[in-house]
């Protein structure tokens, strides 16, 4: 008995209000009179009275109108006391279901969709997604349910039904072919959202659809043939700028240039570079030109993108023509550097070489030749012939010019062009050694004791080379063997020097002759400090006072 | 049990004047019915004036007073009110307080108030 | 507005005859009318709401129907307290309405 079915009640309700929904009754009414109250939000608790019941009747009223899209649902309990406060029945639940009205037109989630999709893509391709909202019940009435469409589109171009909208999830495809971005970048769809599946009120926005490149343009040379001059040798030079046009979106992958030389360019003496701004091929030399060899060069250059062609497209060819001027070119020693051997100590006058430079110049240019730089002033040359000869004496041992047996001079040539060039050469003179230098004992001063004395080590050296040098030997002269003994070591690079009779305490000449390999001898004179004293000392000790 | 209303407050006014009627109420439980206000003409017509809801959430009007005329009650003192202001000589009339009872409106009315707007 | 028009505006019958007043609605109301009872001394009571349903303390002699837009009140058999005025009110549409009155005299 004491039970209410789910009360379903139409949002927005014109009333009059309070408005009748449904009695409360109990059947303990018979035995006693019942007073009858509702609990729950909506009725006592917030929002307080939209719904009341008459104590004494139970007539359950709606006070306002109601709205689906704030409360769905209320759950209120009625109850039910009998004249003195006591409950006669337990809680009933109260549903009171508001049930929707079509009183909200679909909403689109932005006043702009941006989307964007390749040119040339096939119908049937997903552009972008649209969304709209609708308060109202989608779940069962068709009050919430949208249907998209589109309502125009802009431009018209190639025509007006390049795209398509699905009605239920709003996406956004191509339905036609011949998007074509350098014809049309941009379409703006109006887009439609109606509610009741399409039967109901409508609303727009709009969807921007920004087509995006794809490489279906090839570069095209303009002009397609260029001549050039070039100096000869320069290398680095600019050649020629290739200006290209492409018609896709600049400063994109599609629209940067690749430049590629085919041909005419045997020597690879060429290279090619693309601007990063104005997107031209930079032609430079990679190598000096020649123009002896070969005065005109006709390259062959190729264009492409950055980015592959999306389709078969045919490429642009240039036709460059470069013609390579004449320079006056400096005359060149050959070799470069050239190697001489040559006899340390050669007379004044005797020719040491010919050195000479050939001019890469066509016409028979004069050549004359001088020396630039010789550090000792040893060598000249003839200004004609480029001989050189030996002015002063060639000495190996030379340590201030000569490193490693090699003496460096630089020569210049220079040619009577206008105007004159000039080149540079390096003559490097290896000096054969000669036996001009004899044994030297080191050191030369030596200090003995004249009672068990011990022997002195002396080193010998010799400024030249093997074979003019060790084994040495040695030998006392000028009556220096009375008191001295002088031997060479087993090895031939040491002399011992012994005092072998008692000499007072004094400073003495020891006359020591040492010969080389070569039979050089060279006399030196040893100064010996003999001290009073035994066996080793290296200064003499003062004299001894008693006290 | 027998329901009781009734109304004062009733005067002669002016018209652009303000007039508070008053509506007692006893012998039911006041506080969970709602009540409206009608009027009767001098031609005998009566007319709706107002209604507020058992808790005085909500209240509602005809055009014709909409604006100028206010319903309140208290609760506590079981007493129903009717704030009138910006009176023209239309609104002169006999005003009754009644009681809805079963969910239906006008079941219990007093025996009225008499309202003349008049220069 | 929502008219409701009353007929007849005036009745004169005599004691123990039946009687019936109209109210006739220009919109579907459903079961939402009542009749009001005017006396002389101006005092006003609800006889019948919803159509049908009567008040308490209201005598079986009154009973309310409908037809289509067409409402009753008919009295079967009029007594002396029966005589003054009569008014329909509808409350099925908002403003609430009355009937213009039928004024109910003794032949």
């Known amino acids: 008995d004491w039970v209410v079915a789910p009360i379903s009640v139409p949002e927005n309700g014109k009333g009059p209000f309070p408005q009748r929904l449904n009695q409360l009754k109990s059947n303990k009414d018979r035995d006693t009179k019942i007073f009858y109250s509702i609990t729950g939000p909506g009725a006592d608790s917030p929002p307080e009275g939209v719904f009341a019941v008459e104590k004494e009747t139970g007539w359950l009223l709606l006070n306002k109108p109601l709205d689906r899209e704030e409360i769905a649902k209320y759950e209120l309990f009625g109850h039910a006391v009998s004249e003195n406060g006591a409950s006669v029945e337990d809680p009933m639940n109260i549903s009171i279901i508001v049930t929707d009205q079509n009183d909200h037109k679909p909403k689109f989630t932005q006043d702009t969709f941006r989307g964007s999709v390749l040119e040339g893509v096939l119908p049937g391709t997903s552009v972008m997604q649209v969304t709209a909202t609708d308060e109202d019940d989608a779940i069962y009435t068709y009050n919430g349910v949208v249907a998209y469409s589109i309502h125009s589109q802009e431009p018209k171009d190639p025509h007006d039904l390049m795209f398509t909208i699905h009605r239920s999830t709003g996406t956004i495809s191509v339905i036609s072919s011949g998007l074509d971005r350098e014809k049309v970048p941009e379409y703006t769809l109006t887009i439609q959202a109606t509610d009741m599946d399409g039967d109901g009120s409508t609303t727009t926005a709009v969807a921007v659809v920004e087509i995006l490149d794809a490489n279906d343009n090839a570069p095209m040379f303009d002009p397609q043939k260029y001549e050039a001059h070039v100096p000869e040798n320069a290398v680095g030079h600019e050649v020629q700028r290739l200006t290209v046009t492409d018609l896709d979106a600049p400063n994109s992958p599609a629209w940067r240039a690749t430049y590629l030389i085919m041909g005419g360019d045997d020597g690879d003496h060429f290279t090619i570079t693309t601007h990063p701004e104005s997107n031209q091929g930079i032609l430079t030399t990679r190598k000096g030109l020649d123009f002896e060899a070969k005065n005109q060069h006709t390259l062959y250059v190729e264009v492409t993108n950055e980015a592959p062609f999306v389709l078969k497209l045919p490429t642009s060819t240039a036709t460059i023509v470069v013609h390579v001027e004449d320079v006056n070119e400096a005359p060149v020693f050959v070799p470069p550097s050239k190697v001489v051997e040559v006899q340390e100590g050669i007379p004044t006058g005797e020719p040491v070489c010919v050195y000479t430079a050939e001019d890469p110049d066509k016409e028979n240019q004069k050549i004359s030749y001088r020396i630039l730089r010789d550090p000792a002033g040893w060598l000249a040359m003839d200004p004609d012939s480029g001989q050189v000869t030996a002015v002063g004496t060639l000495d190996r041992e030379d340590e201030q010019f000569v490193r490693n047996n090699i003496y460096e001079v630089m020569v210049l040539a220079m040619d009577n062009g206008s105007p004159p060039t000039t080149g540079t050469g390096t003559l490097l003179l290896t000096l054969i050694d000669v036996n001009d230098h004899g044994p030297v004992p080191e050191p030369r001063q030596i200090t003995i004791c004249n009672q068990s004395p011990v022997r002195q080590v002396l080193n010998i050296t010799d400024k030249d080379l093997s074979p003019h040098t060790s084994p040495f030997q040695a030998q006392l002269t000028d009556d220096s063997d009375i008191y001295w003994t002088a031997e060479v070591n087993e090895e031939g690079d040491t002399v011992v020097l012994s005092l072998k009779k008692f000499l007072k305490q004094d400073t003495y000449d020891v006359h020591l002759s040492l010969s080389d390999h070569g039979n050089k001898e060279q006399l030196t004179v040893i100064r010996a400090t003999v001290c009073d004293c035994h066996g080793h000392v290296e200064t003499c000790p003062g004299p001894w006072k008693g006290g | 049990e027998v329901q009781l209303v009734e109304e004062s407050g009733g005067d002669l006014v002016k018209p652009g004047g303000s007039l508070k009627l008053s509506c007692a109420a006893s012998g039911f439980t006041f506080s969970t019915y709602g009540m409206s206000w009608v009027r009767q003409t001098p031609d005998k017509r009566l007319e709706w004036v107002a209604t507020i809801s058992s808790g005085g959430h909500y209240s509602y009007y005809p055009d014709s007073v909409k604006g100028r005329f206010t319903i309140s009650r208290d609760n506590a003192k079981n007493t129903l009110y009717l704030q009138m202001s910006s009176l023209k000589s239309e609104d002169t009339a006999m005003y009754y307080c009644a009681s809805y009872y079963y969910g239906s409106p006008f079941a219990y009315w007093g025996q009225g108030t008499t309202v003349t707007v008049s220069s | 507005e929502l008219q409701m028009t009353q007929s007849p505006s005036s009745l004169s019958a005599s004691l123990g005859e039946r009687v019936s007043l109209t109210c006739r609605a220009s919109?579907?109301?459903?079961?939402?009318l009542n009749w009001l009872q005017q006396k002389p001394d101006g005092t006003i009571k609800r006889l019948i709401y919803d159509t049908s349903s009567l008040d308490s303390g209201v005598p079986k002699r009154f009973s309310g129907s409908r037809s289509g837009s067409d409402y009753s009140l008919t009295i079967s058999s009029l007594e002396s307290e029966d005589f003054g005025d009569y008014y329909c009110?509808?409350?099925?549409?908002?403003?609430?309405?009355f009937g213009a009155g039928t004024k109910l005299e003794i032949k």
């Open positions: 919109q579907d109301i459903g079961s939402s």
């Open positions: 009110v509808q409350y099925g549409s908002s403003p609430l309405t």
